[in-house]
């Protein structure tokens, strides 16, 4: 039965742009209302006029409906319309013919901005000169790498202009290529002339193996010479094994008799036998879509005799791809303790890290983490956030790697994970952390410091608190007081001294009764608001013989502010010549008291001292 309209089949209306685009497709004959569609639903396709009356959402069209447009009908379209069409075709992943691609490319006159939205293979037909800047060309050729270059025959002008432009873009000078260069060229590597094969055989031969279509004469001769020369990656033909032959399959037609004669005959026979027995090993048809296993041979096949059954220093001679192919991740994990002692390059360590990441996508187990050694420096904070580190030995081992350096984001993340895992910053942890990073404690927020149990305070050395600010000492002091409470006077003072920057007035008053002889450096670190209420007599007792040092500090806080609060008469009793105290007959009002009474906080904040001249006569006082 015929449908009354196409809407149930094609979906509801989309955006005006998409609607008009579809109208365009139909009107130009690019989209044929496919009758085979009815076969899928058991219903006839909608009449054309139904679709035109209700322009549908393009995403509901099947790729089948987007196939088979003649090029002539595109010539009248605006560039913008052609671009819309190209994007739609990409979204639907419609396979287009060479002619259709060429036609679309020709109509995209200016270089498109959104390369990612266009059909991949369309880029092959765009002029690379239009993407001349370093960023533009990199974007362009990064996409080309993924395109099917073999849509274009070797001799096609579009294909011939791509390789020189790509080489220029990637900054290749001369004929020497790196592994990265070959990767960046993608399918274009198959077009590299013989001189590249001769000079870069080690990285290029494994790529040529998977090139569809025969190599040209120049390439064949260079490949033959390189293979006969016996250099890497395959070595002398006399040492080839069955797996070497497997890896070379795409190049076997170029070998020639001299090479074949020097391959051990047993190997050739074994290889032939296997090829005939197993159809999947026969020379594959040169299809445009290359079988996946052939592309991966170069990446994953470990050369014969190179597989590691044990991690040892011989692996430092491996190229990155050999490490990737020949070292089993599980073996690596169990023998991580060896890696640190072996002088791997940073690039090789990258490969080893990659292997561990693949083996442990949820994060490494502690048995591996403990032995990471220098590989730890390769970890990102994101990697470390996946870890569960509970052993202090593990923490120490990793901090050792970073010893002598500033605390890196990795180390900060590691410590954070460790402390969170333990629930609190215990004494042993604090001991360890402050041994490696004396300023560690002062890098924590007051909130984080609140999780430090008093027992941990025993691990803190005076230098560990050097960079702490008053807010941090406010948190640490009560913990220290609790930790040292059972010590006698002089011992207690020695321990509590470096925490006194967080001590309140009443504790300072109590200390002044114990003849502690506080040095000036400690006094200068006390909280100003805790020092101000102290009397001259209390300060004298607190400092003992060090009281003379007040003169040198009289212009600095908290001494300056304290002097302003004292009666000059009292200051004079010290015999130090301290000036700036309150003259006789002056009254001191504390604004913080006034604020408490009025309930209206002062703009200056609590605690400023207001000195009011009362000029009270003696008679009045009497």
């Amino acid at each position: 039965m015929a449908l009354p309209t196409a809407r149930p089949l094609l979906g509801s209306c989309g955006t005006p742009a998409l609607g008009s685009l579809l109208f365009l497709l139909f009107s130009l004959g690019w989209v044929q209302p496919s009758r085979t569609l009815a076969g899928e639903t058991g219903q006839e396709a909608a009449p054309l006029d139904g679709v035109l009356a209700n322009p549908p959402n393009i995403s509901s069209l099947s790729p089948r409906q987007l196939l088979g447009f003649p090029c002539a009908e595109v010539s009248g379209l605006s560039t913008e319309r052609v671009r819309e069409l190209a994007v739609a075709l990409a979204q639907k992943n419609v396979k287009l013919s060479t002619e259709q691609l060429r036609c679309l490319a020709h109509r995209l006159s200016e270089p498109p901005e959104d390369l990612d939205a266009l059909p991949l293979d369309l880029l092959l037909f765009l002029n690379p000169d239009a993407f001349s800047g370093p960023q533009a060309c990199t974007r362009f050729f990064s996409r080309i790498t993924k395109a099917n270059v073999d849509l274009l025959p070797r001799g096609a002008p579009e294909r011939q202009r791509l390789l020189p432009a790509a080489l220029a873009c990637w900054g290749v000078r001369g004929s020497l290529l790196s592994e990265a260069d070959v990767r960046a060229l993608g399918g274009l590597a198959c077009d590299l002339p013989g001189r590249f094969v001769a000079e870069s055989a080690e990285v290029l031969l494994p790529r040529l193996v998977s090139c569809p279509g025969p190599l040209d004469q120049d390439q064949q001769e260079a490949a033959r010479a390189a293979l006969q020369g016996g250099g890497p990656p395959y070595g002398p033909p006399s040492t080839w094994s069955v797996s070497t032959m497997d890896a070379l399959r795409g190049l076997l037609p170029v070998l020639g008799q001299p090479i074949i004669r020097s391959i051990p005959q047993g190997i050739v026979a074994a290889w032939r036998q296997r090829s005939s027995r197993d159809p999947s090993w026969r020379q594959p048809e040169r299809t445009i879509l290359r079988p996946r296993f052939r592309r991966e041979v170069e990446k994953t096949a470990c050369p014969s005799g190179k597989k590691a059954r044990e991690i040892d220093e011989s692996l430092i001679f491996y190229k990155k791809w050999e490490l990737e192919a020949c070292v089993d991740a599980a073996l690596l994990a169990t023998q991580m303790d060896r890696v640190n002692a072996i002088p791997f390059t940073y690039e090789q360590l990258d490969v080893l890290k990659h292997k561990l990441d693949e083996l442990y996508p949820q994060g490494y187990p502690e048995s591996v983490i403990q032995h990471l050694g220098y590989l730890f420096l390769k970890m990102s904070p994101e990697d470390i956030r996946k870890w569960n580190v509970t052993s202090l030995e593990t923490l120490k081992a990793l901090l050792e790697v970073n010893k002598g350096h500033e605390m890196s984001p990795q180390v900060a993340t590691l410590i954070d994970r460790f402390v969170k895992g333990r629930g609190q910053l215990d004494k042993d942890t604090l001991d360890t952390l402050t041994a490696f990073y004396p300023g560690y404690l002062c890098s924590l927020s007051p909130e984080e410091l609140s999780s430090v149990p008093p027992s941990s305070i025993w691990a803190v050395r005076p230098q560990d608190l050097d960079t702490c600010d008053p807010r941090q000492l406010d948190v640490l002091y009560p913990k220290a007081r609790l930790a040292f409470q059972n010590m006698n006077g002089s011992e207690y003072f020695v321990k509590i001294q470096s925490f006194l920057g967080g001590a309140p007035t009443e504790d300072l008053k109590a200390l002044s009764q114990q003849n502690v002889s506080m040095d000036l450096a400690t006094f200068m670190k006390l909280r100003t608001d805790a020092v101000l209420p102290l009397t001259v007599a209390e300060v004298q007792k607190l400092l003992g013989p060090h009281v003379e040092g007040l003169k040198a500090e009289e212009r600095h806080r908290p001494v300056r502010d304290w002097i302003l609060r004292q009666r000059q008469d009292d200051l004079d009793t010290l015999g130090l010549g301290l000036q700036g105290g309150i003259p006789n007959g002056y009254l001191v009002l504390d604004l913080s008291m006034q604020e408490a009474l009025s309930g209206t906080p002062c703009l200056l904040g609590p605690g400023p001292v207001l000195t009011v001249l009362a000029l009270l006569l003696a008679s009045t006082l009497a």
Partner: antibody
């Protein structure tokens, strides 16, 4: 140049113990496994065991587990093998050899000849 | 333990001819695409010397007239053309499984 230097000849009484050494040079001693092999006069080769000096990890042929003890002194790049409860059967040439990736032995010492005789 | 049986126990080959030595394992020595079979040469009064590793890979410094082949349980060492200095005893060794084991040896005489 990679060299494995072994003590030349050792004479011992039955029932006693003997310790032979193998001094390595020309490579990082701690980063390769050192193996030991026994060869009786006119006979084949028998693998005794190996030690990875970097962490003292050892593996033994069960046949020699109670006979041989492998140790390594990293400070002097020396591998040692102690053979206990000696009998005439222990008279042989003992080779130390460097293992590669757990797959093969690329360098061999000159051998220590042990003679057990009363 | 894996038992390696070498044959022949001895052979005499004329100068310039081919010598073929066989080594059969009591079970496969293949693992993950590699054959863990190695060949050594030993001359009187000397330690053995590595010739071939992983069945077919020539150790560096060893002349190309030595070649190895095979997989699974059957392995072959070929020497062609044989030279006078090749007179020695040849041993196969498997490293696929602990304990590593050696063949009984094949004594090659050059005529």
């Amino acid at each position: 140049e990679i060299l494995l230097q072994q003590t030349g000849t050792v004479l011992a009484r039955p029932g006693t113990s003997v310790k032979m050494s193998c001094k390595a040079s020309g490579y990082t001693f701690t980063n390769y496994r050192m193996h030991w092999v026994k060869q009786r006069p006119g006979q084949g080769l028998e693998w005794i065991g190996g030690i990875y000096p970097g962490n003292s990890d050892t593996n033994y042929n069960q046949k020699f587990k109670d006979k041989a003890k492998l140790t390594a002194v990293t400070s002097t790049s020396t591998a040692n093998m102690e053979l206990s409860s000696l009998t005439n059967e222990d008279s042989a040439v003992y080779y130390c050899l460097r293992g590669i990736r757990g797959s093969y032995f690329d360098y061999w010492g000159q051998g220590t000849t042990l003679t057990v005789s009363s | 333990d894996i038992v390696l049986t070498q044959s022949p126990a001895s052979l005499a080959v004329s100068l310039g001819q081919r010598a073929t030595i066989s080594c059969k394992a009591s079970q496969s020595v293949d693992y993950d695409g590699d054959s863990y079979m190695n060949w050594y040469q030993q001359k009187p009064g000397q330690p053995p010397k590595l010739l071939i590793y992983a069945a077919s890979n020539l150790e560096s410094g060893i002349p190309a007239r030595f070649s190895g082949s095979g997989s699974g349980t059957d392995f072959t060492l070929n020497i062609h053309p044989v030279e006078e200095e090749d007179a020695a005893t040849y041993y196969c060794q498997q490293s696929n499984e602990d304990p590593s084991t050696f063949g009984g040896g094949t004594k090659l005489e050059v005529k």
